[in-house]
Interface confidence: low
């Protein structure tokens, strides 16, 4: 029996299309595939950012694959050919690995890159990113922000910078159509007449950095002699009710503080007949059904009732 062998793919390379971290991995079929014309050859691709402990593994019949990477670090990838067992009348045959790497040659020292980058997607509508200039950079240094997500033809530059002392320290983004639930890539680079400035790359998903508006229309309703229902409404905007978690702070007679986290726009509170004053505030956050993370809203305006015996009144704002 002659041992069946297969060559690795040819021309394996990582191509940067200018999408700030979304790279193309591509290759050509191996040499000498004539013996396996009836066979569908597959490829096992492994790739990672340099420094990462784990490889991502993909099996594909295609000659290309695309994914996002952290361009602050280098990228390494390897690929080999797989002949399925149906082609070899036995076990799967694998070629040796073809390997490649990619990295962006860094300019400037790390301290020159932007510091404390912070992005917030306000009410799932308006994206704002802010940063601080690098350490020790001169006032002639200016930073520029570029962004890309799947759906844009090419990376776009910020057109509405937030400035301080003539320097760009943030960006107000335009309306970003169909931009959530996919990776959003940002590069902040810089220029200075005195020294090169290090670029910084960031990747996140917009639904994970949402800061909602606070809840509105807080009300009280007497349910029974010892229960009061607190109610509020979701804030105006595109976020559906099913996406909210709420945190409530309730104060009775300036002494008792109750905090609770709930999924609905109501909370039933046990009270005593002696309660003279009741105040509460609510804040909202996007929940785990709609995002992996989020930012608490500001607290709502405080809603209080005082002066009359709570047991004798239905309380509405």
């Amino acid at each position: 029996d002659t041992e069946i062998k297969v060559n690795p793919p040819q021309d394996f390379e990582i191509v940067d299309p200018g999408y700030l971290g979304y790279l193309y991995l591509q290759w050509q079929p191996p040499l000498s595939l004539d013996h396996f014309k009836e066979c569908t050859v597959e490829y096992e691709l492994k790739y990672r950012n340099i420094g990462s402990e784990t490889w991502k593994t993909i099996i594909t019949k295609n000659l290309h694959y695309k994914d996002g990477f952290d361009l602050n670090k280098g990228i390494e990838a390897k690929i080999h050919t797989l002949l399925p067992w149906q082609c070899t009348n036995g076990s799967e045959v694998q070629s040796s690995w073809a390997e490649t790497t990619y990295w962006i040659s860094p300019q400037g020292i790390p301290e020159t890159k932007v510091q404390d980058m912070d992005c917030v997607y306000y009410n799932w509508q308006y994206l704002l990113c802010s940063w601080k200039p690098g350490i020790g950079v001169l006032l002639d240094t200016n930073y520029n922000l570029f962004y890309w997500y799947e759906g844009l033809d090419h990376a776009l530059q910020c057109v509405d910078y937030i400035k301080a002392d003539g320097q760009n320290i943030g960006c107000r983004f335009p309306y970003l159509e169909a931009s959530d639930y996919k990776d959003f890539y940002i590069c902040v680079n810089g220029s200075s007449e005195n020294k090169p400035i290090r670029s910084s790359y960031f990747t996140f998903q917009l639904q994970n950095i949402v800061k909602p508006l606070p809840p509105v229309y807080l009300t009280f309703t007497r349910e029974s002699s010892c229960e009061i229902k607190l109610k509020w409404s979701i804030p105006l905007g595109p976020i559906p009710a099913r996406c909210f978690d709420y945190e409530i702070e309730i104060r009775e007679d300036d002494t008792t503080l109750v905090t609770a986290t709930v999924e609905n726009e109501t909370y039933t509170l046990k009270t005593t007949n002696e309660t003279r004053q009741l105040c509460f505030v609510v804040r909202s956050k996007v929940n785990i059904y709609c995002s992996d993370d989020g930012i608490w809203s500001e607290w709502s305006d405080k809603q209080c009732w005082e002066g009359e015996d709570l047991s004798k009144k239905t309380l509405l704002r």
Partner: nanobody
Framework: EVQLVESGGGLVQPGGSLRLSCEAS????????IGWFRQAPGKEREGVSC????????VYTDSVKGRFRLSRGTAKNTVYLQMSALKPEDTAVYYC?????????????????????WGQGTLVTVSS
């Protein structure tokens, strides 16, 4: 409205094979991902595998790598999960799900949060 229908579940002996099908209808986009999930009795639902309509790439959870294989039917709206060398611990209700908002599969560990349409599930029992 997107509808997903799974089929192909059943009783199989350890070491045996099954092919599950997921047929999707009611969607307009060509760009989407379809994932297979499973939920064993008394356990949380876990991601098994994912395929992208755009790139035909597949991603698998570690426990099924080399045993399960995802593929697309000639009609683009059908996805097959070929399961071989089945083990008793593969016993679960298997669900397929679609996310029409994504074009690439996420990490398996976070996959359950990314899907907006779900099927009703099909039961796979591996037992001798």
């Amino acid at each position: 409205e997107v509808q997903l229908v799974e089929s192909g579940g059943g009783l199989v002996q350890p070491g045996g094979s099954l092919r599950l099908s997921c047929e999707a209808s009611g969607f307009a986009s060509d760009d989407y991902i379809i994932g297979w999930f499973r939920q064993a009795p008394g356990k949380e639902r876990e991601g098994v595998s994912c395929i992208s309509s755009k790139y035909a790439n597949t991603v698998y959870t570690d426990s099924v790598k080399g045993r399960f294989r995802l593929s697309r039917g000639t009609a683009k709206n059908t996805v097959y999960l070929q399961m071989s060398a089945l083990k008793p611990e593969d016993t679960a209700v298997y669900y397929c799900a679609m996310d029409s908002r994504r074009v690439t599969c996420p990490e398996i560990s976070t996959m359950h949060r990314n899907f907006d349409s779900w099927g009703q599930g099909t039961l796979v029992t591996v037992s001798s």
